[in-house]
Interface confidence: medium
């Protein structure tokens, strides 16, 4: 019968010929009367056999990631008679793995959106690297993830690649972050190979800023001939939030005379001071009113950012008109 052990050849061997093992018949008494032959894909080109001894050699550098096993056939012939000594047999040469592939992130580019002010531990995104090396061969394809850039705001779970928030972020200070994640094989041991990826994390806005008046004092004038409904001027607040979180409503907080009103222009987000009652220079030639501004939409959980509405004082001077 045939005698052999399992055949393994390490990939990426640089030697011109690498001894893999020996195929022999137990009838072979070593007097060189038998001839061994190798058949199948790779025979003669990748692998050769010593016809006399049955020793098998790899004569080419192999890449396990290209091909991990070869199925070959062996024959043994009695040189004297030309007849087969053993029935033809199939055998396998396995290419054993070395750590010659770095982890690669295949789903790049990564981009995620997370609300600003999200609490620590909030999941942002999961990144996954793959390693072409053999996962069953030691730690060649066992990956560990780490953060190269993104502290202190983000962290990555070493074994899963899950990125989480580790510190609250304020969109109004910075609205996007580039996080760099490294995946290292060999679970980080010496000889490890690594790959990196970038993740763009954008912060979406939450209503964590109240509108604030640009000026603490506005001065306007109104002619005593102005009819009711006249727009006598505009006031403006600014809000560091964006979109609907920056939509605001102006109102009168204090006007003892009940002479003025404020309406909101929702397109420009300005407050328009309107004359509600006609004024008379001889009766009163200046007025002081206090206006306030609030956001239009404030979710309950964000009310803590909106406790005291911003106010402004408006000095309104009445202009005299010569009366007939």
């Amino acid at each position: 019968g045939w005698v052999w052990n399992q055949f393994f050849v390490p990939e990426e061997m640089n030697t011109t010929s690498h001894h893999i093992g020996q195929l022999r018949s137990d009838l072979d008494n070593g007097n060189n009367s038998f001839q061994y032959k190798l058949l199948g894909a790779g025979a003669g080109s990748t692998f050769i056999i010593d016809e006399r001894t049955g020793d098998i050699y790899a004569i080419q550098k192999l890449d396990r990631e290209e091909r991990s096993l070869y199925i070959l056939r062996a024959q043994v012939i009695d040189i004297a008679t030309g007849r087969a000594v053993e029935p033809e047999s199939e055998f396998v040469i396995k290419v054993s793995d070395i750590n010659d592939n770095e982890p690669k992130f295949l789903d790049e580019p990564y981009e995620a959106i997370v609300p600003e002010m999200s609490p620590e531990g909030t999941l942002v995104i999961q990144v996954t690297a793959s390693d072409a090396d053999d996962p069953s061969s030691g730690n060649n394809a066992r990956l560990l993830y780490s953060l190269l850039q993104g502290q202190p705001y983000f962290s990555v779970e070493p074994t899963t690649g899950v990125i989480r928030i580790s510190s609250k972020m304020d969109r109004e200070l910075q609205d996007e972050y580039w996080v760099i994640i490294q995946a290292k094989d060999m679970i980080g041991q010496p000889g490890a190979l690594s790959g990196t990826t970038s993740v763009l994390i954008k912060l979406s806005d939450v209503n964590d800023n109240k509108p604030i008046f640009k000026e603490s004092l506005y001065r306007l004038t109104v002619s005593e001939s102005a009819p009711t409904g006249t727009s006598i001027g505009t006031i403006m607040a600014y809000d560091n939030d964006i979109g609907e979180n920056a939509e605001m409503d102006y109102s009168i907080e204090e006007d003892d005379s009940q002479t003025f009103d404020i309406i909101t222009n929702h397109e420009t987000q300005e407050g328009i001071v309107i004359l509600k009652k006609k004024v008379d220079f001889e009766h009163q030639n200046h007025y002081g009113i206090r206006a306030k501004v609030k956001n239009h939409h404030v979710p309950e959980q964000l009310m803590k950012y909106h406790t005291e509405a911003s106010t402004t004082f408006i000095k309104i001077q009445v202009e005299d008109v010569d009366e007939p």
């Epitope: 603490s216 001065r219 200046h286 004082f313």
Partner: antibody, heavy 119, light 107 residues
């Protein structure tokens, strides 16, 4: 420190002119409306004129309208009162005063400068 | 214009006594637009009260203001030696007018 210092007062004949100055320091002069208020000897206070912070609007008491002109130079932190066609009844201590941001009352006054109109 | 009339013209009191000064307007004044000032001889006026009842910065709490419409009052709860001076009310709703003053003198 925060202060207003008037100058330019003196004795002038009726019909004459005088220019008063008020130098402001220690606060953001260009943010405040400024006024002149006068006080005749032994009498009460009388408001004279106001100028808005940036100089765009000026208002005067009926008794001085057309004769007095209020102005300011924000780059020099100085308020002025140009007084023409002076009358005996204009004799008074003239104070410059700062209006508060939230009303028309005066939270800061100068020490005053005396203007005497006499023949 | 709105005329402010102060009474009495002179108030003679001793230190520690309570002083009540009155200011009456010829027409209604919004309480938001009435102030009180103190003036000592040879000095500029000093703001005490604005908005009829709000104390200005640094003014002791023995000074208080009240009133609305046409009648306003300045009260000094217990006179200190430095409180003897002339007191003026001022309305600033329609132009700027001052009362003629009340002199608080030592009895």
């Amino acid at each position: 420190q925060v202060q207003l210092v008037e100058s330019g007062g003196g004795v002038v004949q009726p019909g004459g002119s005088l220019r008063l100055s008020c130098a402001a320091s220690g606060f953001s002069f260009s943010s405040y409306d400024m006024d002149w208020v006068r006080q005749a000897p032994g009498k009460g206070l009388e408001w004279v004129a106001v100028i808005w912070y940036e100089g765009s609007n000026k208002y005067y008491a009926e008794s001085v309208r057309g004769r007095f002109t209020i102005s300011r130079d924000n780059s020099k932190n100085t308020l002025f009162l140009q007084m023409n066609s002076l009358r005996v009844e204009d004799t008074a201590v003239y104070y410059c005063a700062r209006e508060t941001g939230e009303g028309w009352y005066f939270d800061l006054w100068g020490q005053g400068t005396l203007v005497t109109v006499s023949s | 214009e709105i005329v402010l009339t102060q009474s009495p013209g002179t108030l003679s009191l001793s230190p520690g006594e309570r002083a009540t000064l009155s200011c009456r307007a010829s027409q209604s004044v919004s309480s938001s637009y009435l102030a009180w000032y103190q003036q000592k001889p040879g000095q500029a006026p000093r703001l005490l009260i604005y908005g009829a009842s709000s104390r200005a910065t640094g003014i002791p709490d023995r000074f208080s203001g009240s009133g609305s419409g046409t009648d306003f009052t300045l009260t000094i709860s217990s006179l200190e030696p430095e409180d003897f001076a002339v007191y003026y009310c001022q309305q600033y709703g329609s132009s700027w007018t001052f009362g003629q003053g009340t002199k608080v003198e030592i009895k």
